[in-house]
């Protein structure tokens, strides 16, 4: 008795965070024995779409020519082989930006921070929102925080960081959103450059220095309590 078919891999190109109106391609990769691929979208009638495999049959392409609110959401894919349907893929969360006006991102007390001290990034929206997100460019896990105030509508969110180290230096943006759909985000804020100067740090190089994989809960999360598979995003609920 053969075991269950291995689950396929699901991903999006050019990525899973897409601006309104832009195109995105969802790929589902199974095995060479696949006869058909099916894409399901959470809270939509299944299947959301079906595609025949592309040669050499181990993957299928699902195209979205122009991103809109309707396409934002959580997807899984399956493939059918002669012995039946596979296990579902890990979920892919497709996020659309541009649903709301852009928030403002600022640094308190200043975007120029001494290493070892603290800085608070403040994301402010014109209209009340219940979710605010902070991202750092070129971080391995770009989404550092997601903050939900238990349904309370607020105009701003504070993202404290301490102690600031060289890892924190870089360009940040924030987004705002409503709790009813975490897949719909505002336009990004204008970028904020955080500059870290080094007067408090030990000048001796660490013998174990390695490439940082994240800016730490410094991602810091900054310690994510949940993750968004394949989207490159990490969510942290406070």
């Amino acid at each position: 008795q053969a075991g269950p078919l291995p689950k396929p891999t699901l991903w999006a190109e050019p990525g899973s965070v897409i601006s309104w109106g832009n195109s995105v391609t969802i790929w589902c990769q199974g095995t060479l024995e696949a006869r058909e691929y099916r894409l399901d979208k959470e809270e939509s009638p299944a299947p959301w779409d079906r595609q025949n495999p592309l040669e050499p049959k181990n993957k299928a392409r699902f195209s979205i020519p122009s991103m809109t609110e309707d396409y934002a959401g959580r997807y899984r894919c399956y493939y059918r082989s002669p012995v039946g349907w596979s296990q579902p893929s890990d979920p892919l969360e497709l996020v659309m930006t541009g649903a709301y006006s852009k928030p403002t991102l600022s640094a308190l007390p200043s975007p120029l921070v001494t290493s070892g001290k603290s800085v608070t990034l403040l994301c402010q929206s014109r209209s009340p929102m219940d979710t605010f997100l902070l991202i750092k460019e070129r971080a391995a896990h770009p989404l550092l925080h997601l903050r939900s105030e238990h349904g309370a509508q607020q105009h701003q969110a504070e993202f404290p960081m301490s102690p600031v180290t060289s890892v924190h230096g870089g360009t940040y943006r924030c987004f705002s959103s409503h709790g009813f759909s975490h897949y719909l985000l505002s336009h990004p804020s204008d970028p904020l450059e955080l500059i870290v100067s080094g007067s408090l740090e030990d000048p001796r190089p660490s013998p174990t220095r390695s490439v940082s994989t994240a800016a730490g809960p410094e991602d810091q999360p900054l310690m994510p309590t949940g993750s968004v598979p394949h989207s490159g995003l990490r969510r942290h609920w406070e």
Partner: antibody, heavy 118, light 107 residues
């Protein structure tokens, strides 16, 4: 489940050396800054040293500068504190703790005891 | 260095009481104030970070407030398991510093 387990404590003579280690599991170690905090016999908590997530920045309390070295191995998920020129005032319970990135230490180990006495 | 002062070193209260523990910083710490609980066996747990944010898994009877230099931890309905020593800590700038602790006992 986040787990931090310290080891290496013991009795050492003044002027001696000791290396404390902390084995981390249950989280992506390389994403977090880490610290050593000690608790004196009088039960006061004192921050000792911090190392950034990539090991590139290290920070020490004044009383241990030049004597203690904090280091980490992200491949092995370990944090170390090399202590030398030990003094009686270094006698304490030493805790390894994870940073939450927002100025707090969100998980602590159970501690390892260091006694400096002749 | 920033000095952290917990003026009350020990406190007696009855089960069910509302208990408030205070902490003062020697200068403005911009809400970077955290509270920890240390049980008699030495176990240390984070309760509250950034003045008022509850750490995951911490019961909602714990709350924090304050700003500038003055901060407090409140336990709204004291339970037996809350018997411990509570420490405040500033995370605004290194060196991070702790208060002297407040030992909570049952009357």
């Amino acid at each position: 489940e986040v787990k931090l387990v310290e080891s290496g404590g013991g009795l050492v003579k003044p002027g001696g050396s000791l290396k404390l280690s902390c084995a981390a599991s249950g989280f992506t170690f390389s994403s977090y800054a880490m610290s050593w905090v000690r608790q004196t016999p009088a039960k006061r908590l004192e921050w000792v040293a911090t190392i950034s997530s990539d090991g590139g920045n290290t920070y020490y309390t004044d009383s241990v500068k030049g004597r203690f070295t904090i280091s980490r191995d992200n491949a092995r998920n370990t944090l170390d504190l090399q202590m030398s020129s030990l003094r009686s005032e270094d006698t304490a319970m030493y805790y390894c703790a994870r940073h939450d990135g927002r100025g707090a230490l969100d998980y602590w180990g159970q501690g390892t005891s260091v006694t400096v006495s002749s | 260095d920033i000095q952290m002062t917990q003026t009350t070193s020990s406190l007696s209260a009855s089960l069910g009481d509302r208990v408030t523990i205070s902490c003062r910083a020697s200068q403005d710490i911009s809400n970077y104030l955290n509270w920890y609980q240390q049980k008699p066996d030495g176990t240390v747990k984070l309760l509250i970070y950034y003045t008022s944010r509850l750490h995951s898994g911490v019961p909602s009877r714990f709350s924090g407030s304050g700003s500038g230099t003055d901060y407090s931890l409140t336990i709204s309905n004291l339970e037996q398991e809350d018997i411990a020593t509570y420490f405040c800590q500033q995370g605004n700038t290194l060196p991070w510093t702790f208060g002297g602790g407040t030992k909570l006992e049952i009357k």
